[in-house]
Interface confidence: medium
């Protein structure tokens, strides 16, 4: 028998520095977790102790903190090279800055293979990108070889900016011939490494003949066997075992997100490359693991540029940006309108002639808007200003919801109106009218939404049975502020871009902003 140790990360999202337990900015260093310096310590410890070790990443290194905003992927290549990753799969967020923003900083700089079997380049891009990413890679490990085959969510064109010259094929259809090719090369130990979410990971394990192990990402799935060491609740045991259509037991793993854990899977293969056993658990990278001094010193050196960036002007406002509790928790506020407009603008994807855009709606809990911005400071808006407005390091995500769920959400928005509670919703692409004289649960008297399947956008009444795409904070997608109906009833959830980054990009693009209060949220006469 031959034993392989797979160390894996996914959805790190720019968390190069250690973070607090909830993956936001580290405040109390003695209780902080993750970060590449700490990850390196643990990886090196395992590499020294065990003979056959692979370090893999399942995508979405890009996007999530000011590190990515400033360094645009150069930081990913630099520190992944320093940690000596063996392979990476492309995630949807790797395309956030377009194909050029992937090629120059990462694909050309990475000293490890970057993989995806279901992305096919066409037109002029085909020759430009040729060889920079691969469908699979055969890696020597000890005296054996291991095949790694990559995959990426086929929803990427709706979630990021891959352009028109990349085709995202069905994962299973694309993977099978590549795995077959590896078999003809006498590679009998094959890992599928990719970024399509836990449901697709399980399907790949079930349907793709010859895949021995699936290492996934995208859905931030936490798997654990035994008592979990932190706040994350396991979605199943680690590894999650899938019985394939040809009767094999295929381990599927994922390691939550944000570099908080290092996935640790030990696989035993027989001489024919069959998996005999698999066991392990994610390792919580808490403060009991010291940060590697040399990587930490490097982080501190790269950090200097970030501090300078956060005080630079992104754009100007010529109006007061009212992000006060008094406004945003009680009525339409122009800071809410600005943020929602930025969220929609960040999701412009003209992928179909029938639709002006795939999504037109935004909702945002007023309690998530934490500060106003005064225009009397020469109108200057900095990253620092925006960090006060959006201090939680969340993301603006894409979900699909039925109209009936949206209606419940808007009822929840005002179910105890007047208490300055955070659930009061700010909106974009939505016109809502409340009657507060009615009883809670029956206060929404009008709810119109902006059409998407139209050449001239206009507002139509919400249809209860129709499925709508909505952009919202990950906090709401996870049921925060009492929006349990969103969490329970959402039909699809894809994590998006860092909240501050979305707004800062929009302000930089617009140069001068002047958001108004324009009647998106109204109260019928006599009730307000």
């Amino acid at each position: 028998a031959w034993e392989l140790t797979i160390l894996h990360t996914n959805d790190v999202h720019s968390r190069l520095e250690q973070t607090s337990e909830d993956s936001s900015k580290c405040v109390n260093a003695s209780r902080c977790m993750g970060g590449v310096a700490r990850l390196f310590t643990k990886v090196q410890q395992i590499r020294r102790a065990e003979p056959n070790v692979l370090l893999l990443d399942a995508g979405d290194q890009y996007q999530g903190t000011i590190w990515f905003t400033v360094y645009k992927g150069a930081e990913v290549a630099h520190f992944m090279n320093a940690l000596r990753y063996d392979a990476m799969a492309l995630g949807n967020h790797e395309f956030d800055n377009g194909v050029e923003g992937l090629i120059e900083p990462l694909l050309k700089e990475a000293k490890f293979p970057i993989l995806s079997a279901n992305i096919k380049a066409k037109g002029p891009l085909a020759s430009q990108i040729s060889g920079l990413y691969l469908p699979y890679k055969v890696l020597p490990v000890g005296d054996e070889v291991v095949g790694i085959v990559g995959y990426t969510s086929k929803e990427t064109p709706f979630l990021s900016n891959p352009g028109t010259n990349l085709v995202f094929e069905d994962e299973i259809t694309a993977l099978q011939p590549e795995v077959d090719k590896l078999k003809t090369l006498n590679v009998n130990k094959i890992i599928a490494l990719g970024h399509s979410g836990f449901e697709m990971d399980k399907l790949i394990a079930q349907k793709v003949r010859g895949v021995d192990v699936v290492v996934g990402g995208h859905s931030n799935t936490f798997l654990y066997t035994g008592n979990p060491p932190s706040k994350e609740v396991p979605a199943g045991k680690y590894p999650f075992i899938v019985t394939s259509d040809d009767g094999r037991k295929v381990p599927v793993v994922q390691a939550y997100a944000f570099g908080k854990y290092l996935g640790y899977l030990k696989i035993e293969f027989d001489e024919r490359g069959n998996v005999i056993s698999s066991h392990g658990n994610p390792i919580l990278l808490n403060s009991s693991i010291p940060e590697d001094p040399s990587i930490k010193a490097d982080i501190n050196k790269w950090r200097i540029k970030l501090d300078n960036y956060s005080t630079q002007e992104l754009g100007k406002t010529i109006v007061y940006l009212d992000g006060s509790s008094q406004s945003c928790r009680f009525r339409e506020c122009n800071m809410g309108n600005l943020i929602c407009d930025a969220m929609i603008n960040n999701n412009l994807r003209h992928t179909d002639e029938m639709f002006w855009n795939h999504v037109s709606m935004c909702i945002l809990n007023g309690g998530g808007i934490r500060s106003p911005i005064d225009e009397r400071n020469n109108g200057t808006i900095t990253w620092e200003n925006l960090a006060a407005v959006l201090p939680f390091g969340g993301t603006f995500d894409l979900v699909q919801l039925k109209g009936s769920t949206l209606k419940k959400a808007f009822e929840h928005s005002v179910h105890r109106y007047g208490q300055s509670t955070g659930e009061f919703l700010q909106v974009g692409g939505i016109h809502v009218v409340y009657d507060l004289s009615r009883k809670p649960g029956d206060r929404v008297v009008k709810l119109d939404v902006l059409c998407t399947k139209c050449r001239v956008p206009s507002y139509d009444p919400l249809k209860m049975d129709e499925v709508y795409k909505v952009i919202l904070p990950n906090f709401l997608a996870n049921g925060g502020d009492g929006f349990q109906m969103i969490k329970d009833e959402l039909l699809r959830h894809d994590s998006g871009d860092q909240d501050i980054n979305v707004v800062s990009t929009y302000i930089s693009k617009m140069k001068v902003i002047y958001p108004a209060v324009e009647g998106r949220i109204k109260f019928s006469t006599g009730s307000h």
């Epitope: 405040v27 109390n28 008094q326 998530g368 934490r370 006060a388 300055s420 502020d481």
Partner: antibody
Framework: QVQLVQSGAEVKKPGASVKVSCKAS????????INWVRQATGQGLEWIGW????????KYNEKFQGRVTITVNTSISTAYMELSSLRSEDTAVYYC??????????????WGQGTTVTVSS | DIQMTQSPSSLSASVGDRVTITCRAS??????LAWYQQKPGKAPKLLLY???TLASGVPSRFSGSGSGTDYTLTISSLQPEDFATYYC?????????FGGGTELEIK
Amino acid sequence: QVQLVQSGAEVKKPGASVKVSCKASGYTFTSYDINWVRQATGQGLEWIGWIYPRDGFTKYNEKFQGRVTITVNTSISTAYMELSSLRSEDTAVYYCARKEGYRGDWYFDVWGQGTTVTVSS
Amino acid sequence: DIQMTQSPSSLSASVGDRVTITCRASGNVHNYLAWYQQKPGKAPKLLLYNAKTLASGVPSRFSGSGSGTDYTLTISSLQPEDFATYYCQHFWSTPWTFGGGTELEIK
């Protein structure tokens, strides 16, 4: 570690005012609400009001409206509760308590040690 | 204003006993309810929130249940350090009132 440290005991005459301070440390002061709660000797707890330090927004228990003022000084991470027109029934231990300002979970997770205010002629 | 009524106001029990304290609201508080423990001369300590979520570091012998207007705090097996006064508090609409307290003493 996260803590709220309150000012020392006060003895006041009826009709006077008292101002109690609450200094926060170990967390980002502007991200959490500060609440004030009082407890008369041998009695239960009574909520007075709260402030959101980032923008100074306050909400008071109507029972105290007009007599209570809650303020903050963010530069020193300190909240204040001033109660005026004191009467003997205001004799109590006054607590400050932190509430998560955003995450949708409602509770007071960190409390000050309490400040005894005695109103006596 | 929503009034919170706790019962019993005092309770004698022994180490190892299972104890239940109830809290009734005068209106629906929709699970926006927290439970606290207070020992003499000390500030209250958070036990549970959202009616049934255990606060960080609180032993699992404490549990909460209920919905609407009626809520319960249960201690499955009393320990010596559990003898204290317990308060419920709602967060539905201001003022956020507390229950009158339940004093738990050693039998």
